[in-house]
Interface confidence: low
């Protein structure tokens, strides 16, 4: 399906609004430090050029690839060298190396100020004054902070953002209407970004075979009535979509995602009975709905897996003929029967099955050798089951904040070399698994918990890759995607770690503590907790609890004082001294 002009093809397929939005996202994800106005200018120039190509596909430069056109445009930015340093060297390369170079310079933790939310009236005025600029600014600010955000999904978020303002800026109580909607979009957006980051890591670090295996397992759970051939087709198409988005090919990605949604809706009968309500929605909402659709009911009459995968004498013959297809079918059959398992567990089982066949099909009596293969799955299944049970019990006993603190201590002891902000961010998010998953029925707990933990631990891996400090983290992150979580779970106290010297400045607090939100106060306390563990990795739970209780009392006392700053100045050194004594 070749076109004389790729840019004209995509402009016509996507329409001007989506085309401009996606180009803005692409540019913002590549040049994360550039001012908004600069990106808008570049996008307008690209759009005007695309229109000339739509009018005449033979016009000059219209036959160039999108990477060439976009890369040339990015390389016109005057301040590239001073703003981005060595990223400017990308511009000396030819395609496709230039795009690869830009991709390698995407920064998962850009040095950008946290987004502050202005007063509701200020936001509503800005929305009414220039709706288009207001929405572009949203795309820009999210994309530059989340350089792997799934671009077509970001357009869906922007549509919801627009709808929230359109509705709430007319409301009697604007704030009561708008703020919960913005909170929900923020939280969903962060989750969506993290989930997509894992997909991109899977593709980029472990290859499309790893991503396809993940997709086979997940889609087989969602669509247990679909035939293997149907699931395989969806997996192939989905892999193409995510490969494109993760590779910065956002126009192709959005176009192919729309085609996939169209295909799924035209073939509902052979996929799932749950797609109907999604398929009545407009494009962005439809694609989102299809991605989030609940699992269909399992067919009632599924036979035992043992017949084809253990008892059959043809197992090795079938495996040898087409290894990946046979393993894919095994994964499909296992996953459609087990919506109660995490995708990562299903992939571990498939890996274990593959290892057994590799060993046994070379043995004197293959059948005898692999006859007990399903028994070997038992410990693999029990490990995450027990982990979820224990952690949910702990969560129910402690509540979210203290559960997070328990994880902070646990992970700081495992990998104390990791930076404190990263440990705080990751442990806080690990701790959110409790509220997210522990309230669910037993059959949904493991898939919720373990697959969520995989997303959070990927964030640790991504941040650690940027600034590697721990061999243990590198090992867990790079050896096996499916075993990352068990690898981290198995880490013990790092005996080789040399405790951090005590720095009183780290435990010096001021009156600004008192005006912080509850969340910000928690982060401050949790930061102090990590620093305490880094200083005294062998401190007991009781010792740490004593210091944290003391800290809470000290902050509460000073925040009630008339002269807060004086109180912090006077009580702070006492708190530090008491803490050192308690940990000695």
């Amino acid at each position: 399906d070749t076109h004389k002009s790729e840019v004209a093809h995509r402009f016509k397929d996507l329409g001007e609004e989506h085309f401009k939005g996606l180009v803005l996202v692409a540019f913002s994800q590549y040049l994360q430090q550039c001012p908004f106005e600069e990106h808008v200018k570049l996008v307008n120039e690209v759009t005007e050029f695309a229109k000339t190509c739509v009018a005449d596909e033979s016009a000059e430069n219209c036959d160039k690839s999108l990477h060439t056109l976009f890369g040339d445009k990015l390389c016109t930015v005057a301040t590239l060298r001073e703003t981005y340093g060595e990223m400017a060297d990308c511009c000396a390369k030819q395609e496709p190396e230039r795009n690869e170079c830009f991709l390698q310079h995407k920064d998962d933790n850009p040095n950008l100020p946290p987004l502050v939310r202005p007063e509701v009236d200020v936001m509503c005025t800005a929305f009414h004054d220039n709706e288009a600029t207001f929405l572009k600014k949203y795309l820009y600010e999210v994309a530059r902070r989340h350089p792997y955000f799934y671009a077509p999904e970001l357009l869906f978020f922007a549509a919801r953002y627009k709808a929230a303002f359109a509705e709430c800026c007319q409301a009697a109580d604007k704030a009561a209407c708008l703020l919960p909607k913005l909170d929900e979009l923020r939280d969903e957006g962060k989750a969506s970004s993290a989930k997509q980051r894992l997909k991109c890591a899977s593709l980029q670090k472990f290859g499309d075979r790893a991503f396809k295996a993940w997709a086979v397992a997940r889609l087989s759970q969602k669509f247990p009535k679909a035939e293997f051939a149907e699931v395989s087709k969806l997996v192939t198409d989905l892999t193409k979509v995510h490969t494109e988005c993760c590779h910065g090919d956002l126009l192709e990605c959005a176009d192919d995602r729309a085609d996939l949604a169209k295909y799924m809706c035209e073939n509902q009968d052979s996929i799932s009975s749950k797609l109907k309500e999604c398929c009545d929605k407009p494009l962005l909402e439809k694609s989102h709905c299809l991605a989030e659709v609940e699992n269909d009911e399992m067919p009632a009459d599924l036979p035992s897996l043992a017949a084809d995968y253990v008892e059959s004498k043809d197992v090795c013959k079938n495996y040898a003929e087409a290894k990946d297809v046979f393993l894919g079918m095994f994964l499909y059959e296992y996953a459609r029967r087990h919506p109660d398992y995490s995708v990562m567990l299903l992939l571990r089982l498939a890996k274990a099955y593959e290892a057994t066949l590799e060993k046994c099909c070379a043995a004197a009596d293959p059948h005898e050798c692999y006859a007990k293969v399903f028994d070997e799955f038992q410990p693999l299944v029990e490990e995450p089951q027990n982990l979820v049970k224990q952690n949910c019990e702990l969560f129910e006993q402690l509540g979210e904040y203290k559960f997070q603190n328990a994880l902070l201590v646990r992970y700081t002891k495992k990998v104390p070399q990791v930076s404190t902000p990263t440990l705080v961010e990751v442990s806080r998010n690990l701790g959110k698994v409790g509220a997210k998953c522990c309230k669910l029925p037993e059959a949904k707990r493991m898939p919720c918990a373990e697959d969520y933990l995989s997303v959070v631990l990927n964030r640790l891996c991504v941040l650690h890759e940027k600034t590697p400090v721990s061999e243990k983290v590198t090992k867990c992150c790079t050896e096996s995607l499916v075993n990352r979580r068990p690898c981290f779970s198995a880490l013990e106290l790092d005996e080789a770690y040399v405790p951090k010297a005590f720095n009183a400045e780290t435990f010096t607090f001021h009156a600004d503590m008192c005006t912080l939100s509850e969340k910000e106060k928690q982060v401050k306390k949790q930061t102090a907790l990590v620093e305490l563990v880094k200083h005294k990795p062998k401190a007991t739970k009781e010792q740490l609890k004593g210091v944290m209780d003391n800290f809470a009392a000290f902050v509460e006392k000073c925040c009630k004082a008339d002269d807060k700053e004086a109180c912090f100045a006077e009580e702070g050194p006492k708190f530090v001294a008491a803490s050192q004594a308690a940990l000695a």
Epitope: D512, T515, S517
Partner: nanobody, 115 residues
Framework: EVQLVESGGGLVQPGGSLRLSCAAS????????MAWYRQAPGKGLEFVSR???????NYPDSVKGRFTISRDNSKNTLYLQMNSLRAEDTAVYYC?????????WGQGTLVTVSS
Amino acid sequence: EVQLVESGGGLVQPGGSLRLSCAASGSIESINRMAWYRQAPGKGLEFVSRISKGGSTNYPDSVKGRFTISRDNSKNTLYLQMNSLRAEDTAVYYCAAGPVWEQFWGQGTLVTVSS
């Protein structure tokens, strides 16, 4: 509500110095953070420096070592001492303040660095 008024801008030669002031009035007891931002012609807003009520400061690399932020709580005034000025420091400088983030802004004072 907090009102902020900047002063001290003007024309200065490259390598020269300038001291900006920002006088705060109104509900200043709620102010915990004060900061300077700047906007060069045709560019976006850029963070220059911040100081908390406790006195801790931070600066981006572009001004670190050349600019110093300070505040006199008794006079409710924020200062920015700018040394070794460069042509690229030309901008409108804004004072900003707030309890948790900088929600109150001044009107700005123009600094031009040119020979």
